[in-house]
């Protein structure tokens, strides 16, 4: 015979074809072998011109031989080489599917591999690819979109060889709050790490605001709106700066009175103040907290104290905000000017958390009167807020 070729090669099959001998023959003897694969020999009829090779090993180079027989006579042997395809991984499955995460698992192919190519695509056409190592049989997908259909595909790799892709389809679960209006809703969506998040005032996606969420203190879900920790940020700022906010949300900052007004207008909020100084800690919680709009000069409402720091905010309840360039306090002198800060001053303060960092002069520093008095500037202070009914919401989520 002549012209031996292979076609339709897969990971376990191939079709051998040849041109028949010119003379009439009784039979053809076909043999094939590969590395670490014992030789298989088959005899077929002399009028056959193709033979299906089955049960081949994947990703293996085979040597195929064929010769003709007529009675006791044997023709010369012709040879062809071919390599089977890399077989695919098996049983690709998406498990632990959440709103933004899922776990892909699969069984490895029979052939050895040098890695896997994972491709996952959402219905909107967003495609992501990742290559993982040869010993990997699972991969955690993150940053997925909630309520979205995904197609995940996997292909085994071995050098230049690529297997066929297999796929699975899954749908991420919907977020409880697609546009969380505060850190409590972000937390109820499953975000439990403190850090920067985007919230949407009144749940409006056009009203995005980046905030720092404290997800650990007393159950978490707090929007931090003030942090003092090292004195690097200047808090002796004007009205405009305090209205808009300033500083680095990861470091020292003030979120802004306009933002506080918009947030507390969304519902009933509680205030938490965390204080730390030379290893000592104290806190104050007020179960009613709100900040009025610019027309009220951001009037403070703070009621319902509990905690260990002492109720120093009660003195400031009902007061408008004051800065050195907009004096709304009841003092003849300007409290913000006198004490180099800004606050809901009265005449003047029991709380001066926006005072001069590290200044232990009377009433000048970061003060919380009922904890450390007016002659000790506190090292660390945070003010934060969350919905007053957060405990109920959290319980409902856990039951769900």
């Amino acid at each position: 015979p002549s012209g031996l070729v292979t076609a339709n090669i897969t990971d376990s099959e191939a079709l051998a074809r040849w041109q028949p001998a010119i003379a009439t023959v009784d039979s053809y003897v076909i043999s094939y072998t590969g590395e670490k694969v014992p030789e298989i020999t088959r005899t077929v009829s002399g009028n056959t011109v193709e033979y299906a090779l089955t049960d081949l090993e994947p990703a293996t180079e085979y040597t195929l031989r064929i010769f003709a027989e007529k009675g006791p006579q044997k023709s010369s042997t012709i040879t062809a080489k071919f390599t089977t395809d890399l077989d695919s991984p098996r049983d690709l499955t998406a498990t632990e599917v959440q709103s933004e995460t899922a776990l892909l698992t699969w069984r490895p192919p029979r052939a050895s591999v040098t890695g896997y190519l994972l491709v996952y695509e959402s219905v909107d056409g967003t495609v992501k690819e990742v290559i993982v190592g040869p010993d990997t049989t699972s991969y955690s997908l993150a940053d997925l979109s909630p309520s979205t259909h995904y197609t995940a595909k996997i292909q085994a790799l071995n050098g230049p060889l690529r297997s066929n892709m297999i796929q699975t389809i899954f749908t991420t679960i919907g977020l409880l709050y697609p546009f969380p209006k505060d850190c409590s809703q972000a937390m109820l969506n499953g975000d439990t790490t403190s850090g920067l998040y985007t919230i949407y005032l009144n749940g409006d996606k056009a009203e995005a605001l980046e905030v720092f969420c404290d997800m650990t203190s007393d159950g978490g879900g707090w929007i931090v709106f003030l942090r003092r920790k090292n004195g690097r940020e200047n808090f002796y700022q004007n009205w405009k700066a305090y209205a808009a906010g300033f500083g680095d949300r990861r470091e020292e900052f003030w979120l802004g009175l306009d933002n506080l007004n918009k947030i507390t207008a969304q519902g009933q909020y509680e205030l938490r103040v965390d204080l730390r100084d030379h290893g000592e800690t104290a806190f104050a919680v007020y179960d009613k907290f709100s900040v009025g709009d610019a027309k009220t000069r951001y009037k403070l409402k703070v009621e319902g104290y509990s905690g260990t720091a002492g109720d120093s905010m009660a003195y400031h309840n009902g007061r408008s905000f004051s800065t050195f360039d907009k004096d709304t306090d009841s003092a003849i002198t300007n409290c913000a000017l006198s004490y180099k800060g800004a606050f809901w001053y009265r005449n003047c303060h029991r709380v001066n958390l926006m005072g001069r960092y590290g200044d232990n002069n009377h009433s000048q520093g970061v003060n919380w009167f009922h904890w450390k008095g007016h002659e000790h500037s506190i090292q660390f202070a945070e003010m934060k807020l969350r919905p007053s009914n957060f405990r109920n919401l959290e319980g409902r989520r856990k039951r769900a």
């Epitope: 104290y305 309840n317 009841s330």
Partner: antibody, heavy 120, light 107 residues
Framework: EVQLVESGGGLVQPGRSLRLSCAAS????????MHWVRQAPGKGLEWVSG????????YYADSVKYRFTISRDNAKNSLYLQMNSLRAEDTALYYC?????????????WGQGTMVTVSS | DIQMTQSPSSLSASVGDRVTITCRAS??????LNWYQQKPGKAPKLLIY???SLQSGVPSRFSGSGSGTDFTLTISSLQPEDFATYYC?????????FGQGTKVDIK
């Protein structure tokens, strides 16, 4: 109209006890701290004791600490002063006073007072 | 405890006079100072809080000033109903202490 009415005063022997009451009306009682202030005959004003709006925090002058106990019943809009181990120097007109805040601050409304006389 | 010292202890004045009473705190108290008026046989009445804020219903002839340790109550034009005893009080810390009082009587 905001009103405070004290009662419970009288003549008592040294070492004995007396309980003063103050009935409040015309305002949301538990939103405000309350106080007792006394005035000995012909003398000035002396703050005696105070209690926060919730009743969770109490405050005393050194002269009455461990002898007097301030308390409140927000459901009944009432303030109390339990006075034990009374001394002659406790003789005074005792005023109940409302604060402007939930914690000790400024006394904006006063009752007319109840007289306590400690004498044998 | 913070000591409050008023001066003078008493003064005689005529209707229409400008009267000034001073109060000194033994330590810095920001503006945590109140003024009360007491007439014989009556309960005290709040006149000024936060050193300079006029209590609702109090005539504008009464005014307060000062900050830190030194404070002043001024009656711009003394009226017959103003003859009384005036007390300052610090609300900075407990115990909340009063001055010894200033008696204003008719000259």
């Amino acid at each position: 109209e905001v009103q405070l009415v004290e009662s419970g005063g009288g003549l008592v022997q040294p070492g004995r006890s007396l309980r003063l009451s103050c009935a409040a009306s015309g305002f949301t009682f538990d939103d405000y701290a309350m106080h007792w202030v006394r005035q000995a005959p012909g003398k000035g004003l002396e703050w005696v004791s105070g209690i926060s709006g919730s009743g969770g925090s109490t405050y005393y002058a050194d002269s009455v600490k461990y002898r007097f106990t301030i308390s409140r019943d927000n459901a009944k809009n009432s303030l109390y002063l339990q006075m034990n181990s009374l001394r002659a120097e406790d003789t005074a007109l005792y005023y109940c006073a409302k604060d402007i805040s939930a914690v000790p601050d400024t006394f904006d409304i006063w009752g007319q007072g109840t007289m306590v006389t400690v004498s044998s | 405890d913070i000591q409050m010292t008023q001066s003078p202890s008493s003064l005689s004045a005529s209707v229409g006079d400008r009267v000034t009473i001073t109060c000194r705190a033994s330590q810095y108290i920001q503006g945590f100072l109140n003024w009360y008026q007491q007439k014989p046989g009556k309960a005290p009445k709040l006149l000024i809080y936060d050193a300079s804020s006029l209590q609702s219903g109090v005539p504008s002839r009464f005014s307060g000033s000062g900050s830190g340790t030194d404070f002043t109550l001024t009656i711009s034009s003394l009226q017959p109903e103003d003859f009384a005893t005036y007390y300052c009080q610090q609300s900075y810390s407990t115990p909340q202490t009063f001055g010894q009082g200033t008696k204003v009587d008719i000259k």
